[in-house]
Amino acid sequence: PLATIPVSTTSLTSSEGSTISTPSVDISTPVTTSIVGDQCSRCKNGGFWDGLKCQCLTPYYGESCEEVVNSIDIAPPETVSAQMELTVTVTSVKFTDELKNHSSQEFREFNKTFTEQMNIVYSGIPEYVGVNITNLRLGSVVVEHDVLLRTKYTPEYKTALDNATEVVKQKITKVTTEQIMTNDNCSALMCFNTTGTQVQNITVTQYDPVEECRQKAEEYEDYFLVEYRDQKPYCISPCESGFNASKNCNHGKCQMSQNGARCLCVTTETHWYSGEDCNQGTQKSHHHHHH
């Protein structure tokens, strides 16, 4: 939200030098008027009258939806995930037709043992969530399954998930190489055919805060940018204070136009201010400049 500037007069001067009489300035080109019943309200920029006030669309606000917000809410997901489609061949269980039926006792027991085995294999991976068998087929038992990974959203989430998928590949390759049958017997929880291990596909959550910011900023997309604070992305215009990209309007008010952020300089009883950043003050009585 914009901070109000205590001034003794209501006039604002744009940094180009023209005096503007009202603080709420219509700086947007697209104007639509919403009329409901007898109530005529100038709800601009796609806003609509709800019977009491204008309901504005992002990124607009104000009585008539004529002003542009300084920041837009973007909500990255709490967590991001990856799904790896893998195939392994289990040799310590012989295939039977009942394994194709996911509600059979055979499938349930196989699923229990397989899940226990995979939980052991991936126990050192913090992103590991679990496995989900998608299909069982002959040979001894070819297990098509998904390995599910999840991590908290951070700007580096893709790297974290990419690293985790690499560790999954290493661990499944290791276990299916080491846990093999000897004389048709398996001494491990499960034994595997080393050559049957394949990674079919990897899908990683796609989330781009910059893209979401640009989409929500609509025609102001070139002037809104993403900055991070405590690993959380903020979609801001230069008029939002407290960020690296914040515009300092000194003795003025920052306002967005379709040409970007500009400063509207204040005029007080003693001074008028000018300059791109409203940092040039002129004393009214003495006409003396000070910086």
Partner: nanobody, 123 residues
Framework: EVQLVESGGGVVQPGGSLRLSCAAS????????WGWFRQRPGKEREAVAL???????FYADSVKGRFTISQDNSKNTLYLQMNSLRAEDTAMYYC?????????????????WGQGTQVTVSS
């Protein structure tokens, strides 16, 4: 839910014989796997004799030629005939079963267990 109940354990002199039985209520497991495991004092549970519905059998090296596993599907019962018993055969013997056709000696892969029957070989 499948229940397995062992019987036939007891005290026997070295060189003697015992026949353990395991009666199953519920599923017959004629299509799966059956097995006998034992746990000696202070040791982990180990596979003694295992059998699967496709004809696979396993015997621990220490019991080969002395123990025989068999099953009677009509009675829903698994047997372990133990001959030439030794002091080192003293253990709690457990019956185990699975609907899966297994090839594994690892007890964690077996989902159904009896309460066990004690076998003590002592002079």
């Amino acid at each position: 839910e499948v229940q397995l109940v062992e019987s036939g354990g007891g005290v026997v002199q070295p060189g003697g014989s015992l026949r353990l039985s395991c009666a199953a209520s519920g599923d017959t497991f004629s299509r799966g796997s059956w097995g006998w495991f034992r746990q000696r004092p202070g040791k982990e549970r180990e596979a003694v004799a295992l059998i699967s519905s496709d004809g696979w059998t396993f015997y621990a090296d220490s019991v080969k030629g002395r123990f025989t596993i068999s099953q009677d599907n009509s009675k829903n019962t698994l047997y372990l005939q133990m001959n030439s018993l030794r002091a080192e055969d003293t253990a709690m013997y457990y019956c185990a079963a699975s609907v899966l056709v297994l090839r594994t000696l690892n007890p964690k892969a077996w989902h159904h267990w009896g309460q066990g029957t004690q076998v003590t070989v002592s002079s």
